[in-house]
Interface confidence: low
């Protein structure tokens, strides 16, 4: 039995709210609408939310009950379309109400917004959160579920489910902990951090299925999952894929309740069949529902199995490699990708696809040659380069890294792709450089074996970053082209950009590096990225400065910032002084 | 849909032989090369044999040397494992799997080699 197949359901919300039981119905309904009407104020919401469950509720005690057999779609697009305010907030996204299903529901889709203009989340006292999590903990987590959600439509709905159980939990131990906050906040920096991971992970993962299609999500999980499961045989590796596409699929298109519930299914067939599957499964699977998928997701590669025959046999020697790739294209090219990741977790993801997609143009090209065979004999030899170039980029920046710290290694990425993408925004290109310079705290401690996996995978996820936000206000042809050609060639395209020479510099403007006493009170991290707009800004206007000019103006900042913190009149210190820093620092570059 | 259905294990006696077949469907078999493996009663996977999608490449782990031969039939998508020279360590429930994976999703067939 297929894990997905099920009996026909006369009504398919009564079927979901049976599955995955009121709280969680309600919880991922909420999620789904604040994706969708990323505006509308949280009582909104929750009125919807709760009038859907009433619904639901009815069809459950009486499935023939009138419209309880509509689509899921058909009924939450009904209901978003109920909002009085929809023209005046969303614009012409109202136009998507005048649309049928499924035209309707892909225009929603469409309006999805991956930057929306939300004031940023201000942490209040913990005394205050811990009040109002005990006044009313359902109304508190549901709006940690509607915050999230609305600012990051595309999250792993399932998966934020598991992180406002987290968040729960951290508020029921520290509000009644000694010291509330030395138990509270790290715990919720930890939450955060990890959620904007988690959403740019499954952005990336939403990406490659609506730009590049299922044949690439089925292919970037056929290696992620052979080299985590390399004892699996290759039937049950093609089969967790085709569940996994299927599960991700729905949560990319808007379908949450079918998405949660097919994940619980799958993370109940891979338990089932852990024997079958990986060794490293048995602790994920004693775990509660969320937990257990959450888990499972996250788990370490297994052991590879001991003295695998090489891959040439098959691939390269075997005189039926062109019948065989002829008669079964893609499946052929899955076992390649399946026995070439599971012996190579040490690979990037997007390396090994990049490997299959030489094999696969090269079958492409030596099939049809007169001697087939000594066309592709040496086709192995062709992956050499394409294995070297990440490594030595990994070597390269892990030196850097290691000899700047995190903080300058950031700085020296925001020069050097202010440079290749100068039109992009400021925002993004700090946003993005910051969270490139992270590959190094996160990459460059692992041994050798676990670096490339590691950073070229990362780098892939926060490349992603850019491009979502680049095609949102597309400005760079160049950032157009390395973001639509290829999505395993992302970081090779960007890593090739040189200095555009193209872009005419920006006019100085002495208002972009004029500073205030209010600098003074920030923390470290809105301090440095103060610091890291103005290097970005720097670029702008003098794309050819070098880096010897660039280090002495961002001194001479670091050392304005601290004296004037530190003067009795900071108000004064920051404006006298900052206009000299201004005149040396056009001196320096020649401005 | 993925299947791989063993057949032909059973109670043999030492010295006896027995054949294996695997009868394969919902992928292209001709397309990849096969192995046979086995799990003893408390102990894990272990690999025996593997062949290539054409059959003109065998391979075996050294204890079954001489005595298993494995084979093929792209025609009828089935693999074979011949058996000879049986022997009580031999007993096991034996897998056919695609590739050279040592783990399954099949069924498998129980062969038991005893006096």
């Known amino acids: 039995r297929g894990v997905f197949r099920r009996d026909a359901h006369k009504s398919e919300v009564a079927h979901r709210f049976k599955d995955l039981g009121e709280e969680n119905f309600k919880a991922l309904v909420l999620i789904a609408f604040a994706q969708y009407l990323q505006q509308c104020p949280f009582e909104d919401h929750v009125k919807l939310v709760n009038e859907v469950t009433e619904f639901a509720k009815t069809c459950v005690a009486d499935e023939s009950a009138e419209n309880c057999d509509k689509s899921l779609h058909t009924l939450f697009g009904d209901k978003l379309c109920t909002v009085a305010t929809l023209r005046e907030t969303y614009g012409e996204m109202a136009d998507c109400c005048a649309k049928q299903e499924p035209e309707r529901n892909e225009c929603f889709l469409q309006h999805k917004d991956d930057n929306p203009n939300l004031p940023r989340l201000v942490r209040p006292e913990v005394d205050v959160m811990c009040t109002a999590f005990h006044d009313n903990e359902e109304t508190f987590l549901k709006k940690y579920l509607y915050e999230i959600a609305r600012r990051h439509p595309y999250f792993y709905a399932p998966e934020l489910l598991f992180f406002a159980k987290r968040y729960k939990a951290a508020f029921t131990e520290c509000c009644q902990a000694a010291d509330k906050a030395a138990c509270l906040l790290p715990k919720l920096d930890e939450l955060r951090d990890e959620g904007k991971a988690s959403s740019a992970k499954q952005r990336l993962k939403c990406a490659s299925l609506q730009k590049f299609g299922e044949r690439a999500f089925k292919a970037w999980a056929v290696a992620r999952l052979s080299q985590r499961f390399p004892k699996a045989e290759f039937a049950e590796v093609s089969k967790l894929v085709t569940d996994l596409t299927k599960v991700h699929t729905e949560c990319c298109h808007g379908d949450l309740l079918e998405c949660a519930d097919d994940r619980a299914d799958l993370a109940k067939y891979i338990c089932e069949n852990q024997d079958s599957i990986s060794s490293k499964l048995k602790e994920c699977c004693e775990k509660p529902l969320l937990e257990k998928s959450h888990c499972i997701a996250e788990v370490e590669n297994d052991e590879m199995p001991a003295d695998l025959p090489s891959l040439a046999a098959d691939f390269v020697e075997s005189k039926d490699v062109c019948k065989n790739y002829a008669e079964a294209k893609d499946v052929f090219l899955g076992m390649f990708l399946y026995e070439y990741a599971r012996r190579h977790p040490d690979y990037s993801v997007v390396l090994l696809l990049r490997l299959a997609k030489t094999y696969e143009t090269t079958l492409e090209k030596c099939c049809a040659a007169a001697d087939p065979h000594e066309c592709y004999a040496k086709v192995f030899d062709e992956f050499k380069p394409l294995v070297e170039e990440p490594q030595n980029l990994i070597k390269q920046n892990c030196e850097l890294f290691e000899q700047l710290g995190e903080y300058k290694f950031q700085n020296a990425l925001l020069v050097r792709y202010t440079k290749k993408v100068p039109q992009v925004s400021t925002p993004t290109l700090v946003e993005v450089s910051r969270n490139l310079g992270k590959v190094g705290s996160k990459c460059c401690k692992h041994p050798e074996a676990k670096r490339m996996p590691c950073a070229e995978d990362y780098l892939s996820v926060v490349l992603n970053q850019l491009c979502v936000l680049h095609e949102k206000t597309p400005v760079s042809d160049r950032v157009t082209k390395c973001c639509t050609e290829s999505l395993v060639n992302r970081r090779p395209c960007f890593s090739a950009l040189e200095v555009d020479e193209t872009y005419v510099p920006k006019e100085f403007n002495a208002e972009t590096f004029t500073f205030h006493a209010d600098i003074c009170t920030l923390s470290e991290k809105e301090r440095q990225i103060k610091k890291q707009t103005a290097l970005v800004e720097l670029v702008k206007h003098k794309p050819k400065a070098t880096k010897e000019q660039l280090k002495a103006v961002m001194d001479d900042f670091a050392a304005f910032v601290e004296k004037c913190c530190k003067a009795d009149d900071k108000e004064t210190c920051f404006a006298e002084e900052g206009k000299k820093l201004v005149a040396a620092s056009q001196a320096a570059l020649g401005l | 849909q993925v299947q791989l259905q063993e057949s032909g294990g059973g109670l043999v006696q030492p010295g006896n032989s027995l054949r294996l077949s695997c009868a394969a469907s919902?992928?292209?078999?001709?397309?990849?090369?096969m192995s046979w493996v086995r799990q003893a009663p408390g102990k894990g996977p272990e690999w025996v044999s593997s062949i290539n999608s054409s059959g003109d490449d065998t391979r075996y782990t050294d204890s079954v040397k001489g005595r298993f031969t494995i084979s093929r039939d792209n025609a009828k998508s089935t693999l074979y494992l011949q058996m000879n020279s049986l022997k009580p360590e031999d007993t096991a429930v034996y897998y056919c799997?695609?590739?050279?994976?040592?783990?399954?999703s099949s069924q498998g067939t129980q062969v038991t080699v005893s006096s």
């Open positions: 799997t695609i590739g050279s994976s040592i783990s399954r």
């Open positions: 919902g992928f292209s078999f001709r397309s990849f090369g």
